[in-house]
Interface confidence: low
């Protein structure tokens, strides 16, 4: 059975957290970062579909970077393999409406993190 | 306390348009997504899709694609609904409802009071 | 799209009675994440539809605990352990999986 600390939501085998307030994307994975975490890193379609469902109206900063003209990676430094298109030019990628799109780095937005589930 | 009040009743011809109108309050408006969902006299409910108030971004059952168009003001948190090229058969009560955002996106948890939306030559 | 079909259509009990409305869709409604978006709506006449169940059996705040609903993959059940006289309108089942949401013909509960 997944454990998840209190405010975290578990799905597969991970926990998520679900950011009420706004930061840019680097404060962003700051946050994660103090809590034992990174941006979320969406490893499946189904994972994919569960983000979208569960985040509501606002779009979610995710785990996803690229330096100009450079592939996608996540926070782990993994390259992305392309399971699902990112819209936009910017060089980080959040969850909107409809799927994965891109900004520029300096924009606010909620965030989503992500690290593995607790088995007790 | 939370409520949407709808736009009042309206009779058309067939051919034009009508704009539907819902106002939120109690809550905040860009924080839930908003549903159409109508009903012909004496008969069941049909769900025509979903804005969100946040992004302005759309869903529309396929059925209602082309002839509908879902819009926001946030500044007046007010949703709209526009039905184009209306026929007899849409004459029916347009409702608006809201969805909790979180794992119960999907479901209405407050419905407005209805629009008749009566179509007739 | 899903067909949601609701049995009976009309359905007629005594005050105190037990009442049992079927809903059956024609795929399964567990959603990727798991969760199962089946929900109950009852409509008064001239009122708006209020949600009683959503998730298949999770009650609404304010839904009076006679009302339950269950079920899984396609078959759905609301039950009334006792109707009262507030209770006579028509019931929807609702599917929230698959896309576009689609809603049950809808049951007509009257008192005998």
């Known amino acids: 059975q997944a454990a998840c600390p209190e405010s975290w939501i578990g799905f597969q085998r991970k926990c998520f957290y679900f950011s009420d307030d706004t930061k840019n994307w680097t404060s962003s994975q700051r946050f994660c970062d103090s809590q034992d975490a990174d941006l979320a890193q969406v490893e499946s379609f189904q994972e994919l579909n569960f983000l979208l469902r569960y985040k509501g109206p606002s779009d979610h900063w995710i785990g996803l970077s690229r330096e100009q003209g450079q592939p996608w990676k996540w926070i782990n430094g993994t390259e992305w393999t392309r399971q699902f298109p990112i819209l936009g030019a910017g060089e980080c990628a959040y969850l909107n409406d409809k799927g994965a799109s891109s900004a520029r780095h300096y924009t606010e937005r909620k965030w989503i993190c992500s690290k593995s589930d607790i088995h007790v | 306390q939370v409520q949407l009040v709808q736009s009042g009743a309206e009779v058309k011809k067939p051919g034009a348009s009508v704009k539907v109108s819902c106002k939120a309050s109690?809550?905040?408006?860009?924080?839930?997504?908003m549903h159409w969902v109508r009903q012909a006299p004496g008969q069941g409910l049909e769900w025509m899709g979903w804005?969100?108030?946040?992004?302005?971004?759309?869903n529309y059952a396929q059925k209602f694609q082309g002839r509908v168009t879902m819009t926001r003001d946030t500044s007046i948190s007010t949703a709209y609904m526009e039905l184009s090229r209306l026929r007899s058969d849409d004459t029916a009560v347009y409702y608006c409802?809201?969805?909790?955002?979180?794992?119960?996106?999907?479901?209405?948890?407050?419905w407005g009071r209805g629009t008749l939306v009566t179509v007739s030559s | 799209d899903v067909v949601m079909t609701q049995s009976p259509l009309s359905l007629p009990v005594s005050l105190g009675q037990p009442a049992s409305i079927s809903c059956r869709s024609n795929?399964?409604?567990?959603?990727?994440?798991?969760?199962?978006?089946l929900n109950w709506f009852q409509q008064r006449a001239g009122q708006s539809p209020r949600r009683l169940v959503y998730?298949?059996?999770n009650r609404d705040s304010g839904v009076p605990d006679r009302f339950s609903g269950s079920g899984s993959g396609t078959d759905f059940t609301l039950r009334i352990s006792r109707v009262e006289a507030e209770d006579v309108g028509v019931y929807y089942c609702?599917?929230?999986?698959?896309?576009?949401?689609?809603f049950g013909q809808g049951t007509k509960l009257e008192i005998k």
């Open positions: 409802a809201f969805a909790q955002p979180g794992a119960e996106t999907l479901n209405f948890d407050l």
């Open positions: 109690g809550y905040t408006f860009t924080g839930y997504y």
């Open positions: 804005i969100n108030p946040n992004s302005g971004g759309t």
């Open positions: 795929q399964s409604l567990v959603y990727s994440d798991g969760g199962t978006y």
């Open positions: 998730k298949v059996s």
């Open positions: 609702m599917q929230g999986t698959h896309w576009p949401y689609t």
